[in-house]
Every structure is written in structure tokens, then in C-alpha cells.
Interface confidence: low
């Protein structure tokens, strides 16, 4: 009617003036809307341009809003993990400045001539912890054998011992046990406790890294359009008092994140076996009281060694024949006292359980993170109506909303009234974050049985592909081994989706 | 940039001690292990020693061992060398390094910066 | 100590090699001085690792229990002395090489 051609556009113009627009693109009054290509074509205070802009904005908004809500989990799953990794770390410094503290007085220059030795196995257990693609069993096997070695040569200054008659050594150590049980226990405990320990800081990683990248992915311009209907239309239709449906919202929303709905199912998968691997943390095969304990081990071992010089020479000699007496060597150093060994059991600092208690809860409160992104981010950002529901704007007029409430993921919105969806082109970047958390659930999975998935010969579908971007502060500044190794590279996913330590490089 | 900055150099006494310290800029200082090395005039680098990241370990060259404490200020990102009973055979430009890494265990080929290196000449 | 050759020389762009033995750790740096007493530069920590401002003509390997740094395509600001550093575990120390002078033609 004649009346409401002449309304004014005085609450447009301010909302646009707000925005950062120029107030010069606003009519005075209602306008003919023919030009309009998103929203409904009555009178409105909207020219072209200032659909086009509001367009843009309402886009940005929604992919600002999108990335706050992934900047929350991150930050979460980045506390945890940070927690996690200096817990861990923490563990294993302690062991190593105990056997540094203790072993000198302990064993003497039994422990002081190999001091070296003792490091490269702390350095390779951190490599191994960090998600270097190390086998830890041969690691133990190749420490304990370098040890004897170096060991019996101490223990036997008076013998000429050459590279011969140490491989004949080598050869009869694996029935002889001269550590005692200690290494094969170190193997089993460690090997579970260390899988555990990193698979589980690996999960945090991986998970923190999807968020980051699906929340890159870029809305389309079919949302685009429905993000602006929902939002602004309301504005240029000369209703700008009127909010968002609930529905509306909730179908548009649906529709713009369609893709990242179909990452449930795997992110459950992993969240429900992070929490299932915490499990593994105690006990006496546990994270907490293996990692923490490694030096106790190693003091038993060279005790063991210790008390059985005399049985374990005869036999060597039996089988290896008699060496040559070495004519500058002095006699056979005496028996020295056994190093005196710290409890094995750490008492539980109760810093562990409380770490996991607090993130057993925090990863049951995002396990529906992305179906019910759509929820939060209308009921959060988007100003939804409280009105009754013919009060509402509709994304036509202010009114009732019919449509129903479509399902969650792709598949769902093939009726989608509010954004055209085509179901049949995924977004390749979230497919393959599924592929990534898939991965990530199989090794966990492997873990809680104690096994290293990247060392079983059936192994999964492939290692991860994605980007581990750098490490934790603390953790690139932890050396990772004193050897070198080509075949000792880092997994994929060994710590990702964190900041590059300041400006380290490993070429 | 990561920047070290020795200082307490110049002309000793025989006998006497000497106390170098060396302020770190541009890392996060607690997370890295530190070590000095010295070069004496027309001569190589020689390791002095080496503390790790928390100050809890310390490792010394032979010829100092005994005479040289290292200790270190996460607070102020501050490392000092202190070497008492100063001799001829002291007289270097004595260089702070940072290792690349953060546990004990690391050595002269962890070093990936250095401070441009204070002059100490020991003389009556 | 450990042993690397006293002097290198090569002409502008040819690669040269220098190599650095007798550690028993089977860990090498290398480092860089113009002149005696002036500033130290590492171009090679950890046999192979690069600092962020080094050129990446430098290169570091270890292969048994020798260290070799490789500059590929050498250039006349590259004449200076390099120093190896590594490990000798019979006295539990850390060691360095006398240095190797290179000389860019």
C-alpha cells in the first residue's frame, strides 16, 4: 500500500552504519526490489550493493563464528595434551636425574664409563614417546647388548677380550641372562606403558589438528546465500526487529555444515578409545609406574650382572673359550656392593588421576561437537527468536516456520528447503580428516591391546597424511637420540596441530 | 632472534676466580640446555661445560674439572661460569652456547647458537 | 681430539666436502669462524640439522663414525675456518676438532 512505500530506512542505515559501510549506498525510503538477488523481491531499504555486502558479512560472520567455536575445543584438547606431555615427561626426566644422581655412587665407573650409554636409551625412549618410528623392543635388545659388552669388559680388565670373542658373547647372553629378569620385564612393562602413554598424547594431537583444519574449509557460496536470507533479509525487508527461527536457523546451518556433521561417527570412535586407553595408565604395568621407574630397572639389572660375574664367566668361557690373559691389565676388579634400589612402586602422586578424571570429562562434553554445531552456533551467534513461532522471521516474512528439522550429515539434506546441498560431491578435506581419525582410533585400538600398530605386519590402511605442524615448546627442545638413524623418522601425526617451536628447524 | 650476551671478562690475577655471565634473549631460556666453550689465543674451541635446562646437572671438561661451576637463572635467563684458581693456561675468549635441546645429554654438536664471546686473559 | 683435514679449497660453485673422524658418539656439529677469536656460527647441529639462517648449501651426514659437512656450490663468503664438535666416551668429554681452513679461489 501507498503508506509503506514511504516508510523510512532509518534502522537499515544504522545497522549498515554499523557494519563499517558507507551510509550513502542506503535509500532514504523503500525502494521497488526487483534488482534483489537473495532476498524476497517486495519493497525494501536494500540496493544491490548493500545486498552484496551484507552477503559477504554474513558469510564471514558465520566462518568467524565456526572458527571461535573449533578455537575453544583446540584450546581444550592443546591443555590437555600440553598436561599429558609434561606429565609424561616429567616421569621419565625423573627417572634418568635419579639413575644420574644415584648410579655414580651406586655402581661407580661401572656406571660412569658407560654414562653415555644410559643417555641414548633415555634419548631413545623420549624418541619413542615422541611418535618416531623406532621399534622399542629391538631398542631395549641393542642397549642391554651394548651394555654386557662394555660390562664384561669392565668387570675383566685382566682379559684381552677382542670384537670375536664379544659376538660369541653376544651369542650366549640370550640364554645366560646375565641381567637377570630385568630386561625382559623392562621390555613388556615399557613397550605397553610407552604405547599407551604416546598413543593417547597422539590422539589429543590429531584431534586438535582436524579441528584445525575443518575449520579452514570454506563455506560455499549455496550457504552463503541461505546465511544472508537468515540473517540480514529480515533487515531489508523492513522487519528488522523480527530474529531468526529456531528451525530456519537450525536448516540452514545444517546445510552449510553438512560435511563437517559426517565427522561424528569417527570423532566418537576416537574420543570413546582415548578415554578407553586411560585405562592402561595404572597398574604395575602402567604409565605412571613404568615410566617413572625405568632406573630401578636398570639398577637391578646391573646387580643381577653384578652377582652372577663368576657363573656367567665360567659358562662364557665354556662357551667361548679361554681368552688371553692381558699382560697390562690389572686383576679382576672386586665385587663391588650392590647398588642400593629405590622402591619400584612410585606411589601414585595423584597428579595422573586427576588429569585424567578432568579429561575423561572434557572429551564427554565434545563428543557431539559437530552435530551440534548447528544448535550451539544458532542458539550462541545468532540471535534466535523467543517469540512465539508466527512471530518469527521465516526467511519470507514474519511468520511460522513449517519445514521440518532436517537430519544431521550430507546425506540428510538432500531435501534440505533452505540450502542447496549436493550430497553426491563430500568435501575432500573432511573426508580425509575422517580418514585421519579412523587411523588415529586403529592405532589407539592397538594400543589398549598393548601392541605398536606401526610395527604389526598387518598394519592399517596407511599412515596418517596429514600435517603434523612442528611440536610442543618443550617438546622440540627434548633431544631426540644421540644416533642418527635415516629410518627414525617422526610419524606423521607424532604431536600435530601446534605451533612450530620458535623458529627451529630440522632439515 | 636468539641472542646471548657474555659478559665479565678482561684481566684476572693467577689464583684469583673469574665469574662470566652470559644473558640469553629470543627463546623460551628454561627449556634448553646451556654450555660454554673457551678458544685460547691462535688455538681451537675447547668444551668447559654444560648445564642442563632445569640447572639440575651439570658436566665439566677435564682441565677446568674441579675449578668450574655452572649455574643458571630461569628467572632471568641468565647462565654464570665460575672458575676459581685462575691460571695462565685460562686466557681465552670463552663463548655461551645453546644446545637445540632440553634434557641432559646434550653436547658440543647440540649447539646451535652462540654469543659472540667474552676475553678473559689471566696474567700478574 | 678429533681429526679433520687442516685445509680445504675449492673454486666458486664447486661443492666441497670436510670430513670429520674419530668421535665415538656418532654425533657431529659444525661451526663457522671468519677469524680467530671473532664469532661462532653454526651451519650443522646433530649431523644433519640446520638453523633457520644458514644457507641451505650446508649440509651435514654421518656415515659410521664420521662426519661430513657438505657445501654445495660454495661461495667466496663461505672462506673461513670450520670447526667439528663430537663425543670421545674413552674420556667421557666433549671434543672439537682443529679446524679446517677453507679457501674459495
Known amino acids: 500500500d501507498p503508506a509503506s512505500k514511504s516508510r523510512s530506512c532509518g534502522e537499515v542505515r544504522q545497522i549498515y552504519g554499523a557494519k563499517g559501510f558507507s551510509l550513502s549506498d542506503v535509500p532514504q525510503a523503500e525502494i521497488s526490489g526487483e534488482h534483489l538477488r537473495i532476498c524476497p523481491q517486495g519493497y525494501t531499504c536494500c540496493t544491490s550493493e548493500m545486498e552484496e555486502n551484507l552477503a559477504n558479512r554474513s558469510h564471514a560472520e558465520l566462518e568467524t563464528a565456526l572458527r571461535d567455536s573449533s578455537r575453544v575445543l583446540q584450546a581444550m584438547l592443546a591443555t590437555q595434551l600440553r598436561s599429558f606431555d609434561d606429565h609424561f615427561q616429567h616421569l621419565l626426566n625423573d627417572s634418568e636425574r635419579t639413575l644420574q644422581a644415584t648410579f655414580p655412587g651406586a655402581f661407580g665407573e661401572l656406571y660412569t664409563q658407560n654414562a653415555r650409554a644410559f643417555r641414548d636409551l633415555y634419548s631413545e625412549l623420549r624418541l619413542y614417546y615422541r611418535g618416531a618410528n623406532l621399534h622399542l623392543e629391538e631398542t631395549l635388545a641393542e642397549f642391554w647388548a651394548r651394555l654386557l659388552e662394555r660390562l664384561f669388559k669392565q668387570l675383566h680388565p685382566q682379559l684381552l677380550l677382542p670384537d670375536d670373542y664379544l659376538d660369541c658373547l653376544g651369542k650366549q647372553a640370550e640364554a645366560l641372562r646375565p641381567f637377570g629378569e630385568a630386561p625382559r620385564e623392562l621390555r613388556l612393562r615399557a613397550t605397553r606403558a610407552f604405547v599407551a602413554a604416546r598413543s593417547f598424547v597422539q590422539g589429543l594431537g590429531v584431534a586438535s589438528d582436524v579441528v584445525r583444519k575443518v575449520a579452514q574449509v570454506p563455506l560455499g557460496p549455496e550457504c552463503s546465500r541461505a546465511v544472508m536470507k537468515l540473517v540480514y533479509c529480515a533487515h531489508c525487508l523492513g522487519v528488522p526487529g523480527a530474529r531468526p527461527c529456531p528451525d530456519y536457523c537450525r536448516n540452514v546451518l545444517k546445510g552449510c555444515l553438512a560435511n563437517q556433521a559426517d565427522l561424528d561417527a569417527e570423532w566418537r570412535n576416537l574420543l570413546d578409545s582415548m578415554v578407553l586407553i586411560t585405562d592402561k595408565f595404572w597398574g604395575t604395568s602402567g604409565v605412571e609406574s613404568v615410566i617413572g621407574s625405568v632406573h630401578t630397572w636398570l639398577a637391578e639389572a646391573i646387580n643381577a650382572l653384578q652377582d652372577n660375574r663368576d657363573t656367567l664367566t665360567a659358562k662364557v668361557i665354556q662357551g667361548c673359550g679361554n681368552p688371553k690373559v692381558n699382560p697390562q691389565g690389572p686383576g679382576p676388579e672386586e665385587k663391588r656392593r650392590r647398588g642400593k634400589l629405590a622402591p619400584r612402586e612410585r606411589p601414585p602422586s595423584g597428579t595422573l588421576e586427576k588429569l585424567v578424571s578432568e579429561a575423561k570429562a572434557q572429551l564427554r562434553d565434545v563428543q557431539d561437537f559437530w552435530i551440534s554445531l548447528p544448535g550451539t552456533l544458532c542458539s550462541e551467534k545468532m540471535a534466535l527468536s523467543t517469540a512465539s513461532d508466527d512471530r518469527c522471521w521465516n526467511g519470507m516474512a514474519r511468520g511460522r516456520y513449517l519445514p521440518e528439522v532436517m537430519g544431521d550429515g550430507l546425506a540428510n539434506q538432500i531435501n534440505n528447503p533452505e540450502v542447496e546441498v549436493d550430497i553426491t560431491k563430500p568435501d575432500m578435506t573432511i573426508r580425509q580428516q575422517i580418514m585421519q581419525l579412523k587411523i588415529m582410533t586403529n592405532r589407539l585400538r592397538s594400543a589398549y591391546n598393548g601392541n605398536d600398530v606401526d610395527f604389526q605386519d598387518a598394519s592399517d590402511d596407511g599412515s596418517g597424511s596429514g600435517s603434523g605442524d612442528g611440536c610442543l615448546d618443550d617438546l622440540c627442545s627434548r633431544k631426540v637420540s644421540r644416533k642418527s638413524s635415516s629410518s627414525r623418522t617422526p610419524l606423521t601425526h607424532a604431536l600435530p596441530g601446534l605451533s612450530e617451536q620458535e623458529g627451529q628447524k630440522t632439515s | 632472534a636468539v641472542t646471548l650476551d657474555e659478559s665479565g671478562g678482561g684481566l684476572q690475577t693467577p689464583g684469583r676466580a673469574l665469574s662470566l655471565v652470559c644473558k640469553a634473549s629470543?627463546?623460551?631460556?628454561?627449556?634448553?640446555?646451556m654450555l660454554w666453550v673457551r678458544q685460547a689465543p691462535g688455538k681451537g674451541l675447547e668444551w668447559v661445560g654444560v648445564?642442563?635446562?632445569?640447572?639440575?646437572?651439570?658436566n665439566y671438561g677435564a682441565a677446568v674439572k674441579g675449578r668450574a661451576t655452572i649455574s643458571r637463572d630461569n628467572g632471568q635467563n641468565t647462565v654464570r661460569l665460575q672458575l676459581n684458581n685462575l691460571r695462565a693456561e685460562d686466557t681465552a675468549t670463552y663463548y655461551c652456547?645453546?644446545?637445540?635441546?632440553?634434557?641432559?645429554?646434550?653436547?658440543?654438536?647440540?649447539?646451535?647458537?652462540w654469543g659472540l664471546g667474552t676475553e678473559v686473559i689471566v696474567s700478574t | 681430539a678429533l681429526t679433520q683435514p687442516s685445509s680445504v679449497s675449492a673454486n666458486p660453485g664447486e661443492t666441497v666436502k670436510i670430513t670429520c673422524s674419530g668421535g665415538s658418539g656418532n654425533n657431529y656439529g659444525w661451526y663457522q669462524q671468519k677469524s680467530p677469536g671473532s664469532a661462532l656460527v653454526t651451519v650443522i647441529y646433530d649431523n644433519n640439522k640446520r638453523p633457520t639462517d644458514i644457507p641451505s648449501r650446508f649440509s651435514g651426514s654421518t656415515s659410521g663414525s664420521t662426519g661430513t659437512l657438505t657445501i654445495t656450490g660454495v661461495q667466496a663468503e663461505d672462506e673461513a675456518v670450520y670447526f667439528c664438535g663430537g663425543y670421545d666416551s674413552s674420556t667421557y668429554a666433549d671434543i672439537f676438532g682443529a679446524g679446517t681452513t677453507l679457501t674459495v679461489l
Open positions: 629470543g627463546f623460551t631460556f628454561s627449556n634448553y640446555d
Open positions: 652456547a645453546k644446545s637445540a635441546y632440553g634434557y641432559y645429554g646434550s653436547g658440543v654438536s647440540d649447539i646451535d647458537a
Open positions: 648445564i642442563s635446562s632445569s640447572g639440575s646437572s651439570t
